[in-house]
Interface confidence: low
């Protein structure tokens, strides 16, 4: 229904706290360089204005669209051109072009320092002094580094953060209480960020239809007892919610997500028997819980998929009459029978089925032509299954750090032109798939591995788009989203690459490495490893292992030495010489 004042409507629906949080996220995601104080001031102004509209919907400007109101606020910021360059040109446009322009200027890799966590005592002090400001800083810092973070979900993580601080700041040993809990939230939030970015990429590059197909497959796996009409309704609603969030319409997105959660909880009987625990929770926890609810038990009496989609005499007629609906029912039926497949795989199978019908329904004897389609799925299914087995075996053998290094070597050989920091970030993220997925039960491994890898590779593509340097990467990133992972997996050593010349300074280290946290030490070593591969792309695994072992030994020796500086300056050059010899 239409409301006289959109901003009053959203304020009333969401309540002041969520309204302010979402406006702060929106501003932080659009203008990523502004300070918290600058954004907090704007948020307060918008909130005060919203309250005047709640009191009187006919008040001046209350009838304006949210894009107009928010855009006008952003464009009124002083020194916009000095700080943001051509983004300031967006302010010369009218809505909706102005908002589109802002969206195009979102930076997936802003040049901001890493978000450092203060030490426990300091954190607890500032949290106790002003919890609202503390959480505002959290929303601001995360949102500007992750401009497509799913806004209602970011409110959920802020709530988690709040609960952890409330609990741990009351304890004697704050540090040991906070660290593991906040690390857990950070890890989950980072995964949430890359997953959501993938959804927005799907929406931006391939439109709502592509996202809806993803949603149908995912929902059918989770709710195999829901009928096709119910799944379609949920997929349509979920597509709307994600479209809004990806498009910067965060108030609408959060409001519609709350409505969807309410609908699911009121219609459990036609959706799933697993929802009650989620539905007992307050709003943010409820929506989060529903988004990762366990799969319902599959109906015991599902007929073979072939009956309706291969053996039925009317296949081509049904397909011709309503292509999208027929393919949708195929995707639904196949997905509800296969919670053990990744969504990417299910979409590849649906695509293969569609291509088969397109070809066969034009022939003289269609049934003879499409009769073998299910058998033709086999290689498509085997490929990711083998990928999971090979990689999980390797992870179990090497552990997370060793597995990351193996991936780093592999990907540097596939795309040596890509910058070393990007390769290291990608390999570290890809390597986490082992810890995340390989410990799961067999039937959950494939969906976990492939859908996580797809999300990480989407980030590789986004970063590469900014500065395209590798034809291999461009080729894989240009195709459809579901084909990306198989494309990257199939890449081999880039034969066109001219190896980097050996530069001693790249492999020269100083005693400051000894005091770095373990994670930073690993990144330094992995940076050196990528550089070694760029120097010798065809180095054997054995050669690289020799060099890395020598390197680790060197660090260990010098970091334990009484005079570290002398050790680094004398042993360092010897290490460089040995490396060159080992790789010769």
């Amino acid at each position: 229904e239409a409301h006289k004042s959109e901003i009053a409507h959203r304020y009333n629906d969401l309540g002041e706290q969520h309204f302010k949080g979402l406006v702060l996220i929106a501003f932080s995601q659009y203008l990523q360089k502004c300070s918290y104080d600058e954004h907090a001031k704007l948020v307060q102004e918008v909130t005060d204005f919203a309250k005047t509209c709640v009191a009187d919907e006919s008040a001046a400007n209350c009838d304006k669209s949210l894009h107009t109101l928010f855009g006008d606020k952003l464009c009124a910021i002083p020194n916009l051109r000095e700080n943001y360059g051509e983004l300031a040109d967006c302010c010369t446009k009218q809505e909706p072009e102005r908002n589109e322009c802002f969206l195009q200027h979102k930076d997936d890799n802003p040049s901001l320092p890493p978000f450092e966590r203060p030490e426990a005592e300091a954190m607890c002090t500032s949290f106790k002094e002003n919890p609202t400001t503390f959480m505002g800083h959290y929303l601001h810092e995360v949102a500007r580094r992750h401009p497509y973070f799913y806004a209602p979900e970011l409110l959920y993580y802020a709530e988690q953060y709040n609960e952890i601080l409330t609990q741990c700041c009351a304890e004697a040993d704050k540090e040991s209480c906070l660290t593991p809990k906040l690390d857990g939230v950070k890890e989950k939030a980072l995964v949430s960020s890359v997953r959501q970015r993938m959804k927005c990429s799907s929406m931006q590059k391939f439109g709502e239809r592509a996202f809806k197909a993803w949603a149908v497959a995912r929902l059918s796996q989770t709710f195999p007892n829901a009928d096709f009409a119910e799944i379609t309704k949920l997929a349509t609603d979920l597509t709307k919610v994600n479209k809004e969030c990806c498009h910067g319409d965060l108030l609408e997105c959060a409001d519609d997500r709350a409505e969807l959660a309410k609908y699911m909880c009121e219609n459990q009987a036609t959706i799933s028997s697993k929802l009650q625990t989620c539905c007992d929770k307050p709003l943010l926890k409820k929506a989060h819980c529903l988004s990762e609810v366990e799969h319902d038990t599959m109906p015991a009496d599902l007929p073979a998929i072939a009956a309706d989609f291969v053996e039925d005499q009317e296949v081509c007629k049904n397909y011709a009459e309503a292509k999208d609906v027929f393919l949708g029912t195929f995707l639904y039926e196949y997905s509800r029978r296969h919670p053990d497949y990744s969504v990417s795989l299910l979409l590849r199978l649906a695509k293969k089925y569609e291509a088969t019908l397109e070809k066969c329904c034009a022939e003289a004897n269609p049934p003879a032509c499409y009769g073998t389609v299910l058998a033709e799925f086999q290689p498509l299914v085997e490929e990711p299954k083998n990928l999971v087995k090979t990689n999980c075996d390797l992870y179990e053998k090497l552990g997370e750090y060793g597995f990351q290094n193996a991936i780093l070597v592999r990907y540097t050989q596939k795309a040596p032109q890509v910058s070393t920091p990007t390769l290291v970030e990608a390999a570290r993220n890809l390597g986490r798939v082992g810890t995340k997925c390989c410990t799961l039960p067999e039937d959950q491994r494939l969906p976990c591995v492939e859908d996580y890898l797809s999300a990480i590779l989407n980030r590789v593509c986004l970063l590469h788009e900014k500065t395209p340097v590798s034809e291999h990467v461009t080729k894989c990133c240009s195709g459809s989203l579901v084909e990306r992972r198989p494309c990257f997996s199939a890449l081999t050593v880039d034969e066109t690459y001219v190896p980097k010349e050996f530069k001693a300074e790249t492999f020269t280290f100083h005693s400051d490495i000894c005091t770095l946290p373990e994670k930073e030490k690993q990144i330094k070593k992995q940076t050196a490893l990528a550089e070694l591969v760029k120097h010798k792309p065809k180095a054997t695994a054995e050669q690289l292992k020799t060099v890395m072992d020598d390197f680790a030994q060197f660090l260990d020796t010098c970091c334990k030495a009484a005079d570290k500086d002398t050790c680094f300056s004398t042993e360092g050059p010897n290490l460089v010489t040995r490396c060159k010899d080992a790789l010769a």
Partner: nanobody, 115 residues
């Protein structure tokens, strides 16, 4: 189609008893927790009691604790509410709902307690 049909309501003296039934169809009754909710005209719905899918875990609102008993028969796909020591303030339309929700998907049954 999901259907919930309540019965057993009526007019009763304060201190008296009633047994409400809710016959369910169109879904796997034995897989879902169920609740009783009541509503007085002009007021919002009030959650009364809930029972888990197996019938082992029951929960009650403070206002009716010790007087009402919720139970279920999964074979018969029926939910029950045994109401004892009824008070005038228990007067309302009683609905059964799926899960612990206060949303109403049924007609309800009127319970009137006179003093």
């Amino acid at each position: 189609e999901v259907q919930l049909v309540e019965s057993g309501g009526g007019l009763v003296q304060a201190g008296g008893s009633l047994r409400l039934s809710c016959a369910a169809s169109g879904f796997t009754f034995g897989s879902f927790g169920m609740s009783w909710v009541r509503q007085v005209p002009g007021k919002g719905p009030e959650w009364v009691s809930a029972i888990d899918s197996g019938g082992t875990d029951t929960r009650y609102a403070e206002s009716i604790k010790g007087r009402f008993i919720i139970s279920r028969d999964n074979a018969k796909k029926t939910l029950y509410l045994q109401m004892n020591s009824l008070k005038p303030e228990d007067t309302a339309v009683y609905y059964c709902t799926i899960g612990q929700s206060t949303s109403r998907g049924s007609q309800g049954t009127q319970v009137t307690v006179s003093s």
